[in-house]
């Protein structure tokens, strides 16, 4: 009869930039040599080759040189496709044909994903609010895929969903930009969250916003930063604001503007003697020359580094002279944990299994969570590490040691502290004996 | 009803700078996406510079550096400031709101900018 | 950058037939959920004006006759029955990825 080729029935969901496993296999008869084999990896809609191996050979990737198939478990079966550095535009059907004397195919989806960022909160106007202005509150969340939800509620988490226009802008690698816009008149204060989700991921990245309108004090100059952290993801650029209330008459030649590292008073930026001195600080930091004039001293960091994480005090001097200290709290998402299983061959109940859990590239550092299939907690026989690359980002690896039940289901959840970001792996043992893994 | 009046254009030399001003009405205006799009003599349509608000902005490459998209929340302005311009920025300049999808839902009538020795 | 090519560059058609304008991507605008693929009416000495958005949406206020359709690569543009004010340049644009860009236009004419 026809070769039965087996695929998973639910899309491989893969992080932009980590690679995949596309999972096919075949029961191979006694005797099978891989001489007899065929195998033709291809894009489902288009029939465009991705990879094969023919005439007892691999025959290599057709797929920008990111395929590889796994040579060593070709004869067990196993004819599973490695996608490296997935990109957007691999989401698709994938479909895996075998032929030895008889012929198979099956497809299976790739759903390629992305963490939104933590969303950023702007508020215009931002100085001298008082009840009943209304003000335009804009919430961005970068470089997420597929499109996210947005959603808005007040202090006392009860939906916003009048006046929000919201618009997804794609980017240069056709990951999504997230703005979302939300009119309000302003109360005595008030609290606005916004929530965006990550349909794919199940990811929410949330900020909020207190407004309390009041008039400021008269006297030396009040420069304002924001209380919470500035939260931002490695590599894409950080606003730190900055403002103060420029008097009737003030002109730029009266302002010098200095920001510098709050603990080694290292120069950052400044602006002096009515021009922008420019950065000192590796070239990556700028101002908003435009916005200067209306008291807007904010400084934007771009490409953003582990090492800058830290205190940065913004200091105005006009006549009078004022200053303050703002966070930048470093972020980067873990990926989504890659489970390995050793011994990974003929278990049966009451073995010892080593369970590792590994989530790779994020920051800060890690909270890993194991639990059962039932959802109960496993604490004991864990050993986790974080190593820290060449970036200062972190690798985390979770060691469960377990002993075999007739099944089981174990959990694994690596935790962003910052982003509150939750990345989970899973692995199900069945059955005696078995081999891991069901599916590569 | 939604209405853009682009202004502001007129010949200038290579080399020289621009700011083209579109008063928007009939719409919240800090509640959308604006943008610029110019055609040029040939009939040819480039997007030219989108802002979500004062610090939210993209460009293309080829615009990035010269051209800087701004907006006046207060008086429903938006702004194309131009500078170091070439013959090639030559075309007419439409001021645009943005769909939710960067689409171009609305547009203005356009104002004429030359550059010429 | 994502080049769109439409064809024809000018089509010529009888008053009460169909109309279609293809546009041509040169790689996907389409994820699973939308066709970033947009279309536009322009008329001499006026802006250009949106017909369809996301592929095969009618924006507000343009007649049925309009339909959009295609994803992926593959984008078409129908006008059916064809009336003697359709006469103009049709434009698509994509709004996939950074830049957004816009074909090259086709011009109908009213037989």
């Known amino acids: 009869g026809a070769l039965e080729v087996q695929v998973p029935e639910d899309p491989v969901v893969a992080l932009v930039g980590t690679d995949a496993t596309l999972c096919c296999s075949f029961s191979p008869e006694p005797g099978f040599s891989l001489a007899q084999l065929n195998l033709i990896w291809q894009l489902t809609d288009t029939k465009q080759l991705v990879h094969s191996f023919a005439e007892g050979q691999d025959q290599g990737s057709a797929y920008a040189n990111r395929t590889a198939l796994f040579p060593d478990l070709l004869a067990q079966g196993n004819a599973s496709l490695r996608l490296q550095r997935v990109r957007v535009a691999d989401e698709g059907s994938f479909t895996c044909f075998v032929s030895i004397r008889d012929f198979g195919s099956a497809a299976v989806s790739l759903q390629v994903a992305a963490p939104y960022s933590k969303p950023s909160m702007t508020l215009e106007p931002n100085k001298d609010l008082r009840p009943g202005d209304t003000v335009t509150i804009t919430c961005s969340s970068y470089q997420g895929y597929p499109e996210a939800e947005v959603f808005w509620q007040d202090g006392q988490g009860v939906p916003l969903t009048g006046n929000v226009t919201t618009s997804q802008m794609a980017n240069e690698q056709g990951l999504f930009d997230v703005h979302s816009i939300l009119r309000v008149v302003l109360g005595a204060n008030g609290t606005y969250s916004c929530l965006v989700r990550n349909p794919v991921l199940q990811q929410d990245a949330h900020s909020s916003v207190t407004i309390t309108p009041q008039r400021s004090p008269t006297g030396a100059v009040e420069v304002q930063v924001p209380e919470d952290p500035v939260v931002a993801l490695v590599g894409t650029d950080a606003t730190l604001r900055c403002s103060f209330s420029p008097e009737p008459g003030f002109s730029l030649a009266q302002l010098n503007l200095i920001w510098q590292l709050t603990d080694t008073k290292q120069l950052v930026h400044s602006f002096t003697e009515g021009r922008d001195q420019g950065s000192a600080y590796a070239n990556r930091t700028a101002l908003f020359p435009d916005l200067l004039a209306q008291g807007n001293a904010s400084l934007r960091l771009q490409r953003v580094r582990v090492a800058d994480e830290g205190s940065f005090t913004c200091f105005v001097s006009i006549r009078d002279f004022g200053s303050a200290a703002v966070s930048l709290q470093v972020a980067a998402p873990y990926s989504k944990p890659s489970m390995t299983l050793e011994p990974n061959k003929d278990l049966r109940p009451g073995d010892t299994v080593t369970i590792t859990c590994s989530s790779y590239r994020g920051y800060p550092e890690a909270e890993v969570f194991w639990q059962d299939g039932q959802g109960v907690p496993l604490t004991g026989n864990v050993t986790t590490s974080q190593m820290a690359n060449e970036q200062g980002l972190f690798d985390v690896h979770s060691v469960l040691r377990v002993v075999l039940g007739a099944n089981g289901t174990y959990s694994c959840l690596v935790r962003n502290p910052v982003l509150q970001q939750d990345a989970h792996g899973s692995v199900t043992i069945t059955g005696q004996p078995m081999t891991f893994p069901p599916e590569a | 009803e939604v209405k853009l009046v682009e202004s502001g254009g007129g010949l200038v030399q290579p080399g020289g700078s621009l700011k083209l001003s579109c008063a928007a009405s009939g719409f919240t205006f800090s509640s959308y996406i604006m943008s610029w799009v110019r055609q040029t003599p040939e009939k040819r349509l480039e997007w030219v510079a989108s802002i979500v608000s004062s610090n939210i902005t993209y460009y293309p490459d080829s615009m990035k550096g010269r051209f800087t998209i701004s907006r006046d929340n207060a008086r429903n302005i938006l702004y194309l400031q131009m500078s170091s311009l070439k013959s090639e920025d030559t075309a007419m300049y439409y001021c645009a709101r943005s769909g939710t999808r960067a689409w171009f839902a609305y547009w203005g009538q356009g104002t004429l900018v030359t550059v010429s020795a | 950058d994502i080049v769109l090519t439409q064809s024809p560059a000018s089509l010529a058609v009888s008053l009460g037939q169909r109309a279609t304008i293809s546009c041509r991507a040169s790689?996907?605008?389409?994820?699973?959920?939308?066709?970033?693929m947009h279309w536009y009416q322009q008329k001499p000495g006026q802006p250009p004006k949106l017909l369809i958005y996301?592929?095969?949406n009618l924006e507000s206020g343009v007649p049925a006759r309009f339909s959009g359709s295609g994803s992926g690569t593959d984008f078409t543009l129908n006008i059916h029955p064809v009336e003697e004010e359709d006469a103009a340049t049709y434009y698509c644009?994509?709004?996939?990825?950074?830049?957004?860009?816009f074909g090259g236009g086709t011009k109908l004419e009213i037989k």
């Open positions: 790689k996907s605008v389409s994820t699973s959920a939308y066709s970033y």
């Open positions: 996301l592929a095969s």
């Open positions: 644009q994509h709004s996939r990825e950074l830049p957004y860009t």
